[in-house]
């Protein structure tokens, strides 16, 4: 628990440089994002294909998306799970990252000092072990998040059935109902392909019990929709009369000294047919 | 035929607290979310929350958090409502329903016939 | 909350007359919906997603509308439409009801 108060953001006087003051495992060990680069990684040919079970929500339920004031959240039923792991994690929510429309790079983790569009995050916890994500989210093992590199490209349909309901999001506080549709639809080609680590929250308060599911594959959304998702928020109430933009809502990469990134593939990229002519 | 049934309405005292039954039949259970709608006399429709029977998740109303709780009991297709601290203002019929998502929207396309709940000393 | 705001709250009209029930959105919605209440029973699903009619209603019965302005139209009022109608949004959170548009025989 922070040591007073809750108010945090990603820019000005509560921005993540003082984060730590209020929730001190922001300065703490293991934390995320990072900065994914060839001289930490690990292949570990014990890092199975993971598998998605109960992803495929019916459009016959209603899911709770939020404007949360840090981003907007989709609330996830406990069983969604992942099977592969050492104990079942149930998913909890998901949410995302993203820049702005002048800087459109707003990714977490980067790749070989990168950053994507915007980022996904599934957020699931040790059902085995806690009763509920909250519960789980200041234990060892208590947390899993899937994360998605989102780059700008074609037009995803997926995607738009969260975008599509922005509108009714758009102040912090505010809530809408989304039809149940299948989340595994949000994920990459080639899930199997993955980066692994233990690290932690990237929002306050930062816990340092989060096993990290990087997709090795990006997801495209496109230009409109990006520019959606950067410009239909604000971190504000409706009636605050100094409404500010949700916008940049992503943790600088964090140091990782010491450490490895455990990979599920082998890096050789394979070449393409023209890179072999 | 798909059928909601409410019971375990009645008269109760202020500050005391209703347990209604909502047990459901003709349709694969698990399958839809239940919701509880109240209807004061004379006066419209309002929302008190759901609970998924899949899983036990429920979200409610903001006006009815902490003194609504919704349950399931999912080997008898039966959806629980207990409220708290019932004051006058809770006396209404306490409708149970089904949405159905159809084409693009839902709607609720089954009621049961309510159960009136009476809050009074 | 998005309030919703039917008028009138009541109306009188004759078998045959052509009547239009109005309901506002306090926000911007996507669809709407209406039920129909008779005394003493549960509502009924009667149009969805702003137009759209729930099997085996008449087809005298239309819906319009959209963003904040919603109407359901009756074009020819017959003796068993006469009873109590609802709009209801699912856009927001609370999903939210009407106040109830009473319509009674002249």
């Known amino acids: 628990a922070p040591v007073n108060g809750s108010k945090w953001t990603y820019f000005g006087p509560d921005g993540e440089n003082s984060w730590s003051k209020k929730y001190p495992s922001c300065g703490g060990l293991l934390q995320s994002p990072i900065d994914l680069h060839s001289d930490i990684l690990q292949y570990d040919a014990s890092l199975t294909p993971l598998e998605f079970q109960g992803y495929n929500l019916s459009a016959n339920k209603q899911f709770l998306l939020t404007n949360n004031g840090h981003s907007v959240k989709l609330n996830l039923p406990s069983d969604m799970h992942i099977q592969g792991l050492q104990s079942r994690y149930s998913a909890t929510q998901l949410h995302l990252h993203w820049g702005n429309p002048n800087d459109p790079h707003g990714s977490e983790h980067t790749v070989s000092g990168q950053h994507f569009a915007a980022e996904l995050h599934i957020v699931h916890y040790n059902s085995d072990l806690y009763p509920d994500a909250s519960t789980a989210s200041n234990k060892s093992e208590g947390l899993a998040v899937l994360a998605v590199l989102i780059e700008m490209g074609s037009f995803n349909p997926s995607y738009d059935k969260i975008f599509s309901h922005l509108q009714h999001v758009k102040y912090k506080g505010q809530e809408a109902f989304v039809p149940g549709f299948n989340i595994e639809e949000l994920l990459p080609e080639r899930t199997a392909e993955y980066y692994r680590y233990r690290g932690s929250l990237t929002t306050p308060p930062c816990n340092p019990t989060v096993l990290w599911t990087v997709f090795r594959n990006p997801v495209q959304i496109s230009q409109e929709q990006l520019l959606a998702l950067e410009t239909a928020l604000y971190c504000t109430h409706m009636d605050d009369p100094s409404p500010r933009e949700m916008i940049n809502n992503f943790r600088q990469v964090q140091k990782f000294d010491e450490r490895l990134v455990y990979t599920s593939f082998s890096q050789v990229q394979v070449c393409t047919a023209a890179g072999l002519s | 035929e798909v059928q909601l049934v409410e019971s375990g309405g009645g008269l109760v005292q202020p500050g005391g607290s209703l347990r209604l039954s909502c047990a459901a039949s003709?349709?694969?259970?698990?399958?839809?979310?239940i919701y509880w709608v109240r209807q004061a006399p004379g006066k419209g429709l309002e929302w008190v929350g759901y609970?998924?029977?899949?899983?036990?998740?429920?979200t409610y109303n903001q006006k009815f958090k902490g003194r609504a709780t919704i349950s399931v009991d999912k080997s008898k297709n039966t959806a629980y409502l207990q409220m708290n601290s019932l004051r006058a203002e809770d006396t209404a019929v306490y409708y149970c329903s089904r949405p159905i998502y159809y084409g693009a929207y839902w709607y609720f396309d089954v009621w049961g016939q309510g159960t009136l709940v009476t809050v009074s000393s | 909350d998005i309030q919703m705001t039917q008028s009138p709250s009541s109306l009188s009209a004759s078998v045959g007359d052509r009547v239009t029930i109005t309901c506002r959105a306090s926000?911007?919605?996507?669809?709407m919906h209406w039920y129909q209440q008779k005394p003493g029973k549960a509502p009924k699903p009667w149009i969805y997603?702003?137009?759209q009619l729930v099997s085996g209603v008449p087809s005298r019965f239309s819906g319009s509308g959209s963003g904040t302005d919603f109407t359901l139209t009756i074009s020819s009022l017959q003796p068993e439409d006469f009873a109590t109608y609802y709009c209801?949004?699912?856009?927001?959170?609370?999903?939210?009801f009407g106040q109830g548009t009473k319509v009674e025989i002249k």
């Open positions: 926000s911007s919605v996507t669809y």
């Open positions: 997603g702003t137009s």
């Open positions: 609970i998924d029977p899949a899983n036990g998740d429920t």
């Open positions: 003709g349709y694969s259970y698990t399958d839809y979310n």
């Open positions: 209801q949004q699912w856009s927001s959170n609370p999903l939210t």
